[in-house]
C-alpha cells in the first residue's frame, strides 16, 4: 500500500538540499514525548547535558524544547514538482545556546553548545507519518532518524517507508 520508499528516493536529495533562509520560518516551544507518552528530559550533569527518556511523576513539569522550523529547497531533479519541492527542517534547543546534534559515528543524539550558523548535524527533516506524531530525520544522514533505544535517544536507521511508522521513531509535541 506504500509508494516508492521515500527514504531511498531522497537519499541524495537531502545532502544537496539547502536551507532557503537563515531565519526560521516559525518557532514553537513544546514538550517532547515518545509515542508511548514517556517524556524527553534534559539534565545538566558535570557541565554537560544528558538526555533521558522517562516516565514523569504525576504533576511533574515537562521540559520544553524550542523547535525552529526552516524551509529547505528540495533539488528540482529529485522532485516531481520543480521549484515548489520544499521540506521543513527543524532544530531543537532545550536551553539557550544548546542544540540537539546527530552524532552519526556513535549513532547517538547529543546536546552541543554552539553558535549560529548551526552545523548540518543540528538540522532534522520533519516528517508527519501521523497527524499528531512527528519524526526527525538527520539532514547529514538520510534514512537515519532520532529514535528511542534503552531509555535514551539514539540514531536509528530506517530502510523502508513501512518502518517510518515504527513507534520508536515517533514523537509527540505538546505546547501545553
Amino acid at each position: 500500500a506504500f509508494g516508492i520508499s521515500g527514504v531511498q528516493k531522497y537519499t541524495r536529495a537531502l545532502h544537496d538540499s539547502s536551507i532557503t533562509g537563515i531565519s526560521p520560518i516559525t518557532e514553537y516551544l513544546a514538550s517532547l514525548s515518545t509515542y508511548n507518552d514517556q517524556s524527553i528530559t534534559f539534565a545538566l550533569e558535570d557541565e554537560s547535558y544528558e538526555i533521558y527518556v522517562e516516565d514523569l511523576k504525576k504533576d511533574e513539569k515537562k521540559d520544553k524544547v524550542l523547535l525552529s522550523y526552516y524551509e529547505s529547497q528540495h533539488p528540482s531533479n529529485e522532485s516531481g514538482d520543480g521549484v515548489d519541492g520544499k521540506m521543513l527542517m527543524v532544530t531543537l534547543s532545550p536551553t539557550k545556546d544548546f542544540w540537539l546534534h546527530a552524532n552519526n559515528k556513535e549513532h547517538s543524539v547529543e546536546l552541543h553548545k554552539c553558535e549560529k550558523p548551526l552545523p548540518d548535524q543540528a538540522f532534522f527533516v520533519l516528517h508527519n507519518m501521523h497527524s499528531n506524531c512527528v519524526s526527525f530525520e538527520c539532514k547529514t544522514d538520510p534514512g537515519v532518524f532520532i529514535g528511542v533505544k534503552d531509555n535514551h535517544l539514539a540514531l536509528i536507521k530506517v530502510d523502508s517507508s513501512e518502518n517510518l511508522c515504527t513507534e520508536n521513531i515517533l514523537f509527540k509535541l505538546s505546547e501545553t
Epitope: 500500500a1 506504500f2 509508494g3 516508492i4 521515500g6 528516493k9 531522497y10 520560518i25 516559525t26 518557532e27 514553537y28 528540495h74 522532485s79 516531481g80 514538482d81 515548489d84 519541492g85 520544499k86 521540506m87 521543513l88 527533516v125 520533519l126 516528517h127 508527519n128 507519518m129 501521523h130 497527524s131 512527528v134 517507508s161 517510518l164 511508522c165
Partner: antibody
Framework: EVQLVESGGGLVQPGGSLRLSCAAS????????VSWVRQAPGKGLEWVAE????????NFNENFKGRFTISRDNAKNSLYLQMNSLRAEDTAVYYC???????????????WGQGTLVTVSS | DIQMTQSPSSLSASVGDRVTITCKAS??????LAWYQQKPGKAPKLLIY???NRYTGVPSRFSGSGSGTDFTLTISSLQPEDFATYYC?????????FGGGTKVEIK
Amino acid sequence: EVQLVESGGGLVQPGGSLRLSCAASGFTFTDYWVSWVRQAPGKGLEWVAEIYPNSGADNFNENFKGRFTISRDNAKNSLYLQMNSLRAEDTAVYYCARGPYYYSTQIIFAYWGQGTLVTVSS
Amino acid sequence: DIQMTQSPSSLSASVGDRVTITCKASQNVGNNLAWYQQKPGKAPKLLIYYASNRYTGVPSRFSGSGSGTDFTLTISSLQPEDFATYYCQRIYNSPPTFGGGTKVEIK
C-alpha cells in the same frame, strides 16, 4: 505541473451518499498530505479532512467524523471522500488541496483543484 | 476551536489605493496564519503563510504582518486583478479554521 482534479459531485437526496474523487498528477502523491476543503454557496471555506497517502494516516474536522471518510489509492494517485447521511447543509463546492511541504502537514493549502459541486436536495 | 474574525467583511477601493484587511484570532496562534485570495468561480490561491511569508509567485505589493491574535494583510497599491475575496486561515494545528472573508470591490 501540479494538478488536482476533482470529480463525483452532483445532485443527491437528503440521507443519500456520494463518493468524491481527486486525481493528482505532477508530483509524488505519497509525499504530501492532501486535504478536502468545502465551500457552501456564497459562504466561506471549511476544512473537512486530510490524509497522508504514504501511511494512510488521516485527520478529521470533528464536525464530519462518523459521516465522512477519507481514503486514497496510491496506485491511481487518487484521493477520495465518502460522504454518507448527506444533509441540505452539505451542499457545497468540494475542493481537493495540497500543502507546500514534503512529508509534513502544516495544514497550509498551496495547490487547489477546480472543485466539484455537491447539491443535496429533494 | 479557535475562531478567526475578519474585518471589514467588505470594502470598496480604487486602483492604486492602499488596502488593509485585518484578522483576529480568539486565542494566541503565534505566527500560524495564512492568507488566500479567491475570485468568483475559482479556487482560492495562497498569498501569505506563517503570517508574513509571501508564497512563490505572489507579487510584492501583498504583505502580511502580525502575531499572536492580530494580523494584517496589506495590498500596497491595488491592481485591477486584486478585486476578489480574501480569507485568513489558522494553520499548523488541527482543525485549521478560516475567517469569514473580506470582499474587495471596485469603488
